[in-house]
């Protein structure tokens, strides 16, 4: 669940998620609305969609704890756990590397962004 995600994002990006990403823009952190503000925000919007899909599949996205290995900068999702746990790991792995890919466009001004300013059409999944 959330502990896995925090640890994974820290390992991959080198940033403390609680200080750098939760919240950030209009979609990083709990909830999400409006048009994503930048590429980093798009990572989180896509991750929300990934979680939404798993919810429709009956997975407990915040409760399920999965196993994974982090070595030489890569994440390997373990095939030990249940289907839901493995898919959850895949969602989190994707967002972690997406955030890393977009570190160069990270904007400090979007940290703790005021959500009422998040306007426009929320992208569909």
């Amino acid at each position: 669940g959330i502990l896995n995600l925090n640890k994974m994002v820290k390992q991959v990006t080198g940033k403390m998620p609680i200080l750098s990403y939760w919240p950030y823009g209009c979609h990083c952190g709990l909830g999400g609305r409006g048009q994503p503000k930048d590429a980093t925000d798009w990572c989180c919007q896509t991750h929300d969609c990934c979680y939404d899909h798993l919810k429709t599949q009956g997975c407990s996205i915040y409760k399920d704890y999965y196993r994974y290995n982090f070595s030489q900068g890569n994440i390997h999702c373990s095939d030990k756990g249940s289907w839901c746990e493995q898919q959850l790991c895949a969602c989190d792995k994707e967002v972690a590397f997406c955030l890393k890919r977009n570190l160069d466009t990270y904007q400090k001004r979007l940290r703790f962004y005021w959500r009422p300013h998040c306007r426009g059409q929320t992208p569909g999944c």
């Epitope: 429709t56 599949q57 009956g58 997975c59 407990s60 399920d64 196993r67 095939d79 030990k80 756990g81 249940s82 289907w83 839901c84 746990e85 493995q86 898919q87």
Partner: antibody
Framework: QVTLKESGPGILQSSQTLSLTCSFS??????????VSWIRQSSRKGLEWLAH???????RYDPSLKSRLTISKDTSRNQVFLKITSVDTADTATYYC????????????????WGTGTTVTVSS | QIVLTQSPAIMSASPGEKVTISCSAS?????MYWYQQKPGSSPKPWIY???TLASGVPARFSGSGSGTSYSLTISSMEAEDAATYYC?????????FGAGTKLELK
Amino acid sequence: QVTLKESGPGILQSSQTLSLTCSFSGFSLSTSRMGVSWIRQSSRKGLEWLAHIYWDDDKRYDPSLKSRLTISKDTSRNQVFLKITSVDTADTATYYCARRALSDYGSDFYFDVWGTGTTVTVSS
Amino acid sequence: QIVLTQSPAIMSASPGEKVTISCSASSIVSYMYWYQQKPGSSPKPWIYRTSTLASGVPARFSGSGSGTSYSLTISSMEAEDAATYYCQQYHTYPLTFGAGTKLELK
């Protein structure tokens, strides 16, 4: 040829600890992704998965029984063990050990080879 | 945990008859696995990943389903098919089994 064979006390008293052994051949628990589960079967509750141990000593338990279960292994002797504490008559069952199938799909989790089972009776 | 409900609990079929055994999950599962068990023997893997027959399983058996509804079908019942069939899931932890369907020869 892969085989598994369970052994246990047969009969024991309520409140005692049940110790079971699964001796296997034809595969090694040091092989990556390999794992063995304990499953029991009773007329009251049907088939009930209890615990699973992986090649790297990672363990999983049925949450409703977790506090009473301990699974362990001796890789060199090709054995897996299960301990159940504070047994009562509800633990009367046939106990099986079974190997998790090594599938091409990581998300598969089923059992391709089962032991013959050992019958355990708990008397009050 | 996900509860698997099998129906019917007991059924009988004549040789040559088509047989369908159902397994209903209390919430969505990705795949279903099936085992066959005969009296005095341990369960044998029968169908995995919903529809793939295990090694040595006759082609008259098939598996299908998605979501919460799965089934095992025998196109033409034979005497050796008389057994108890169990479904199993590991979509979410913990792994669970159905209570079984006992198939008898009429």
